[in-house]
């Protein structure tokens, strides 16, 4: 309506404050100056606006900054961030970790939305790599963040950042991701002593090769079954019965309960039944006595 386009007398906003909370859509549009809004964005988050009112405020900022908001505005978006689309966010250049934290805080309690995923992507790309402080921040808000990255993206994580990773951050990682993360973890923790090293490296072992598992078996680490079951099958198969016994220590008894599941099932099929019997667990399915085992892969390699 034409008469609603002009700001009514006495309603022009001199500052962003709670006097605006009951303004109608058209009043906000007509009476709030976009430049004033941009300089006082930090106040918006302390005022209970309806979503409809937030839409009007966003529209004002969009008109003021058609190429994307400056970081000074982004950092104080607060609740208004929930109104942004991934397309809006792709126009931003977010470089400050404080800005990232402020926006993640707004989204706390929600699942990782497309908006947040876009924000993180923009931020990480802008930094060039996933440094320790960023990773610390992201995994604090989203424990599963690391496992949402592709192996290619994970390759940009510097070994120093691995110190920020907690075991629960790796819960949903698949073997391809752990293949990338394990060598970084090994490098990051290389100066630690045996027992401390094992505590730190344990959650990354799903990416460990056979030779590293053999080395661990010599260190009395007492690996639990849950960790063992997450090891790469191809890394477990070459281990001898004696090596697995040393690797698991007192947890070796748990093999019986897992004998039908990979990698235990496949490992049993590769062992001599005689050797399995030495464990006294009643594991069945090993290679019968008197049978010759040919390693065809080795034969092919030689030819």
């Amino acid at each position: 309506e034409v008469e609603k386009t002009a700001c009514p007398s006495g309603k022009k906003a001199r500052e962003i404050d709670e006097s605006l909370i009951f303004y109608k859509k058209w009043e906000l549009e007509a009476c709030v100056d976009a430049a004033l809004l941009a300089t006082q964005m930090d106040r918006v988050n302390a005022i209970p606006f309806t979503y409809e009112q937030l839409d009007v405020l966003k529209h004002k900022l969009d008109e003021l900054y058609p190429q994307g908001y400056p970081e000074s505005v982004i950092q104080h978006l607060g609740y208004l961030f929930l109104k942004m689309s991934p397309e809006d966010i792709r126009k931003w250049n977010v470089t400050s970790l404080e800005t990232l934290k402020a926006l993640l805080e707004v989204n706390k309690g929600h699942e990782m939305s497309p908006q947040v995923a876009t924000l993180i992507d923009r931020f990480v790309k802008g930094r060039g790599q996933l440094d320790k402080d960023t990773l610390d921040t992201l995994t604090a808000f989203y424990p599963g963040y690391l496992c949402s990255l592709s192996p290619e993206e994970l390759s940009s994580v510097p070994p120093s950042s691995i110190w920020a990773v907690r075991p629960q951050d790796l819960d949903t990682c698949d073997p391809r991701q752990l293949d990338v993360l394990y060598p970084k973890a090994r490098l990051a923790f290389q100066n630690m002593n045996g027992s401390e090293y094992f505590v730190k490296i344990q959650s990354f072992l799903g990416g460990a090769p056979t030779e590293d598992l053999k080395a661990l078996s010599q260190q009395n680490v007492s690996m639990d079954l849950a960790t063992f079951m997450k090891l790469r099958t191809d890394a477990v198969l070459p281990l001898t019965v004696a090596e697995v016994q040393k690797l698991l220590g007192p947890h070796v008894e748990g093999l019986k309960a897992e004998e039908r599941h990979r990698p235990v099932r496949d490992w049993i099929l590769r062992q001599r039944q005689d050797d399995l019997d030495t464990l006294g667990l009643g594991l069945q399915g090993g290679i019968p006595n008197g049978y010759l085992v040919l390693d065809l892969s080795m034969q092919e390699a030689l030819s």
Epitope: E18, I21, F22, A46, F49, T50, L82
Partner: antibody, heavy 119, light 106 residues
Framework: EVQLLESGGGLVQPGGSLRLSCAAS????????MSWVRQAPGKGLEWVSA????????YYADSVKGRFTISRDNSKNTLYLQMNSLRAEDTAVYYC????????????WGRGTLVTVSS | IQLTQSPSSLSASVGDRVTITCRAS??????LAWYQQKPGKAPKLLIY???SLESGVPSRFSGSGSGTDFTLTISSLQPEDFATYYC?????????FGGGTKVEIK
Amino acid sequence: EVQLLESGGGLVQPGGSLRLSCAASGFTFSSYAMSWVRQAPGKGLEWVSAISGSGGSTYYADSVKGRFTISRDNSKNTLYLQMNSLRAEDTAVYYCAKVFANSWYFDLWGRGTLVTVSS
Amino acid sequence: IQLTQSPSSLSASVGDRVTITCRASQGISSALAWYQQKPGKAPKLLIYDASSLESGVPSRFSGSGSGTDFTLTISSLQPEDFATYYCQQFNNYPLTFGGGTKVEIK
């Protein structure tokens, strides 16, 4: 303890007046917008009125506009609802409710006070 | 904006999964809250922003939806969950509530 406690309800004749009070404690009262929400016997919830933290801005549902006045005294941590020209349909339990910091839902409610308008 | 809750009442047993829906007469983004009210008591906030769980509320309660259709789910009904549930929109003024859904013991 964070709480809201209403008082002032009672039996009043049609056309009469009543003033409800809501005493707040355990939070910085002046920092939050506040509301009155009512519930007629056996019915649902109806938003009646709201007021900004400073008391400078108010809002009323069409059903009470011109008859009810919301106000607050931040020095006493108290919210008020002055109800005039009461009608039978205003009979309800009136709840005082704290508005969340930056969005219009209610994260704290009082126990309510019953207003009965009857001759 | 009108909010229509369905069903208006339902009977369920302890351990059941219960779903209540709230439909808005026009789009309200995710500006929706859910409350629980027991007889003679004040409403209690359960969910805000359509899916965010209020602090201290058991995780068996969850909310979903956006736009016009919203759902409150109780994954495994407990004895203390028998009550009336209301949705409320805060997309625009006037704020409005749904008519309520009473959850009774079967």
